[in-house]
Interface confidence: low
């Protein structure tokens, strides 16, 4: 798995809803693949981490003043939905096909 | 300035183009306010860091398994342009009013 020494990339993160206390309202699935963005944003920033101009600037400033300015951060840049069966406000089981923003589609340096 | 112990926020970051080697093609300004996003994404994530669902989930998983899963990261979520006078490919000084993505407008937890 990607650690701090490796470049920014998408890694597996299985999330169990019971672990985060969401099993009280999410009926299914019991767990899902959320993914996590892990790794460093090292100079030079590669195209596959889709750096913004600000991220490029910050990376260059970090090279010059590493104790003063941090590196850019490896974060989700695109998210995808999952399907969930949840209890609505009335406790009625409701299926949401696209519960947005729950799983990482792409990581990048920001 | 905001450190790791403080909450995610926008802090000042003055960038001198000479420091990053961009003075070879950017004529003016000599420096600009890029800002930097600094601070931690601590539970509970406040509305002002506009967390995605994934960031909320990751924060909760981090609470449960802090050594396995990292916190969400404080990054620019909205960028703004600056105006620059630069040398084009022919070396001709050219004014670009909106050189996009150079300065942080907002920070958030992702």
């Amino acid at each position: 798995s990607a650690g701090a020494g490796s470049h920014c990339q998408k890694t597996s993160l299985r999330v169990n809803f019971e672990d985060i206390g969401w099993d009280s309202w999410i009926i299914a699935p019991k767990e899902y693949e959320a993914y996590e963005c892990k790794g460093g944003c090292f100079f030079p920033l590669a195209d596959d981490v889709t750096p913004t101009k600000h991220a490029i600037v910050q990376t260059l400033v970090h090279l010059k003043f590493p104790t003063k300015v941090g590196k850019a951060c490896c974060v989700p840049t695109k998210l995808s939905p999952i399907s969930v069966l949840y209890k609505d406000d009335m406790g009625v089981p409701t299926l949401k096909y696209h519960y947005e923003g729950m799983s990482v589609a792409e990581c990048g340096c920001r | 300035s905001a450190g790791a112990g403080s909450h995610c926020q926008k802090t000042s970051l003055r960038v001198n183009f000479e420091d990053i080697g961009w003075d070879s093609w950017i004529i003016a300004p000599k420096e600009y306010e890029a800002y930097e996003c600094k601070g931690g994404c601590f539970f509970p994530l406040a509305d002002d860091v506009t967390p995605t669902k994934h960031a909320i989930v990751q924060t909760l998983v981090h609470l449960k398994f802090p050594t396995k899963v990292g916190k969400a990261c404080c990054v620019p979520t909205k960028l703004s342009p600056i105006s620059v006078l630069y040398k084009d490919d022919m070396g001709v000084p050219t004014l670009k009013y909106h050189y996009e993505g150079m300065s942080v407008a907002e920070c958030g937890c992702r």
């Epitope: 597996s12 299985r14 009926i27 299914a28 699935p29 019991k30 899902y32 693949e33 993914y35 995808s80 999952i82 399907s83 069966l85 089981p93 409701t94 299926l95 096909y97 799983s103 589609a105 | -």
Partner: antibody, heavy 119, light 107 residues
């Protein structure tokens, strides 16, 4: 133990109709998604339809508008009403249980029932 | 719809061999990939669910790995009863789709 038993297969002419049944036992039927999967002679598996524990239904494009999946939770029975049958619908039809209430792995399967569409 | 592509479509192996079958999804299916074994005239049997979880009662020589778009089923030491056809299937979303199958034959 979990058991699924299909019935209703047989020989039918093109354009005809057939209704398959799947009797389930050994588990709380209403809490699981149930699917129909078919296999043409000498071919691979093709998913046909699903009814979620919520009552939502989905179909493969190849059967949409012709087949209807339904369930009777009081009778622990799954159905597949097949209309406007075509020669390419000839297959062994399996009833399978999803491992939970929405789409998931198919953890238990019936023995299958053969549907032959021929004139 | 999500397309599932298995490779190889068939393979010949001997008892004791290590066998690997791959499955590729046309788009990200996270870890929602399942593997089935089918013997002639029989119903399919679930081996692995959610990419890497061994179904109860399945021998530990079967294992699965992968996430996203690329997945692998491995049989660490092929046994006589393992000669069969293997299918992958995605359960990320409807319509559920199967791979075309991999037939494991005796060499």
């Amino acid at each position: 133990q979990v058991q699924l038993l299909e019935s209703g297969g047989g020989l039918v002419q093109p354009g005809g109709s057939l209704r398959l049944s799947c009797a389930a036992s050994g588990f709380t039927f209403s809490s699981y998604a149930m699917s129909w999967v078919r296999q043409a002679p000498g071919k691979g598996l093709e998913w046909v339809s699903i009814t979620l524990g919520t009552g939502h239904t989905h179909y493969a494009d190849s059967v949409k508008g012709r087949f209807t999946i339904s369930r009777d939770n009081s009778k622990n029975t799954l159905y597949l009403q097949m209309n406007s049958l075509r020669a390419e619908d000839t297959a062994v039809y399996y009833c399978a249980r999803g491992s939970y209430i929405i789409w998931s792995a198919l953890d238990y399967w019936g023995q299958g029932t053969l549907v032959t569409v021929s004139s | 719809d999500i397309q599932m592509t298995q490779s190889p479509s068939s393979l010949s192996a001997s008892v004791g061999d290590r066998v690997t079958i791959t499955c590729r999804a046309s788009q990200d299916i996270r870890s929602y990939l399942n593997w089935y074994q089918q013997k002639p005239g029989k119903a399919p049997k679930l081996l692995i669910y959610d990419a890497s979880n061994l179904q109860s009662g399945v021998p530990s020589r079967f294992s699965g790995s992968g996430s996203g778009t690329d997945f692998t089923l491995t049989i660490s030491s092929l046994q006589p009863e393992d000669f069969a056809t293997y299918y992958c299937q995605q359960s990320d979303t409807s319509p559920l789709t199967f791979g075309q199958g991999t037939k494991v034959e005796i060499k």
